[in-house]
């Protein structure tokens, strides 16, 4: 639902992390709350403490194992509960049956680097982090370039509709400082969303050669 005054939203990074946000208007800031994960077909269960991120919003990460371990599959269902302390007992505040591969949000791409730069173009590569081998090549990317005098919000989005971990930026201005970001999304999952943007990569195009027509 989307019309309530509270929300319990979780995403799976496709490997060993479920990140959750619980928000509730008028909730007490000093209440101790946690998220409890009970998979339907695993021997483990996991808990994380919800920590405030804003006036009425809490977040936590369920660490299911080593970062690159495949802890859940497409057939898993994890019952997630928000529990808050009320005196001596814990009270369930929210509950959901979580289908991890329907609610994916990958880690931001990493290791951005300039492969080759010229006066008007720049070739950039990156890597995906902690992404499941289940996706094979079923990923897409969005990239954006920050030009001088503009904001990230104004930057046009470049869409790569396949698993392509590089891009060749064209029609750049010589001897100009730019920044570049990329994000990734699996094609799978009804409620899957884009990863966070990568850390920006700063680069400068080469100056135009003196006395030459560019």
């Amino acid at each position: 639902a989307v019309n309530g005054t509270s929300q319990f939203t979780c995403f799976y990074n496709s490997r060993a992390n479920i990140s959750c946000v619980w928000s509730q208007d008028g909730a007490l800031q000093d209440t101790s709350c946690q998220v409890h994960a009970w998979p339907d077909r695993r021997r483990w269960n996991q808990t994380c403490e919800l920590l405030p991120v804003s006036q009425a919003s809490w977040a936590c990460n369920l660490i299911l194992g080593a970062p690159d371990s495949q802890k859940l599959t497409t057939v898993d269902i994890v019952t997630l509960r928000v529990l808050c302390r009320e005196g001596v007992r814990w009270r369930v505040m929210a509950i959901q049956d979580f289908k991890p591969f329907e609610n994916l949000r990958l880690m931001a791409p990493i290791s951005l680097q300039v492969v080759h730069v010229e006066t008007h173009r720049c070739n950039i590569s990156w890597e995906i982090s902690q992404a499941s081998h289940y996706f094979e090549r079923h990923l897409e990317f969005e990239a954006r370039t920050l030009s001088p005098g503009h904001t990230w919000e104004e930057a046009p989005l470049l869409t790569l509709k396949q698993k392509q971990e590089w891009i060749c930026l064209e029609t750049l201005t010589p001897d100009t400082q730019y920044e570049f970001q990329v994000r990734v999304k699996p094609l799978q999952g009804e409620f899957t969303t884009w990863s966070p943007w990568s850390q920006p990569l700063a680069f400068r195009t080469k100056p135009a050669a003196l006395g030459k027509d560019t």
């Epitope: 309530g4 005054t5 319990f8 939203t9 339907d40 959901q96």
Partner: nanobody
Framework: QVQLVESGGELVQGGASLRLSCAAS????????MAWFRQAPEKEREFVAL????????LYADSVKGRFTISRDNARKMVYLQMNSLKPEDTAVYYC???????????????????WGQGTQVTVSS
């Protein structure tokens, strides 16, 4: 859209049992939260019980714990509320409700739920 239709409400004596049914149709969720609420005259709608569609996890209001049992039949898209040892204070209109995904959160608040049935009247006489 999701349609929810309740049935099974009637007039019974205190101590009797009753089973309410809720039939879901339309765009049903494969992993929704399904709940029963009730509303007595001049009172606010209150949470009774919840079941998660996929795993069958359940939650109950303290006032009905041990007397009421919520269950579901996934194949038939049905949710049931078995009510035993009924008391006069259980008299109310009983509503079936569905939430998510995405989930609003606090399951015992009626404004969490997007979809509601029209209700079925349960009257318990002393």
């Amino acid at each position: 859209q999701v349609q929810l239709v309740e049935s099974g409400g009637e007039l019974v004596q205190g101590g009797a049992s009753l089973r309410l049914s809720c039939a879901a149709s339309g765009r049903t969720f494969s992993n929704a939260n399904m709940a029963w609420f009730r509303q007595a005259p001049e009172k606010e709608r209150e949470f009774v019980a919840l079941i998660t569609w996929s795993s069958g996890s359940t939650l109950y209001a303290d006032s009905v714990k041990g007397r009421f049992t919520i269950s579901r039949d996934n194949a038939r898209k049905m949710v049931y509320l078995q009510m035993n040892s009924l008391k006069p204070e259980d008299t109310a209109v009983y509503y079936c409700a569905a939430d998510g995904p995405p989930y609003s959160g606090t399951y015992y608040r009626y404004d969490t739920y997007d979809y509601w049935g029209q209700g079925t009247q349960v009257t318990v006489s002393s």
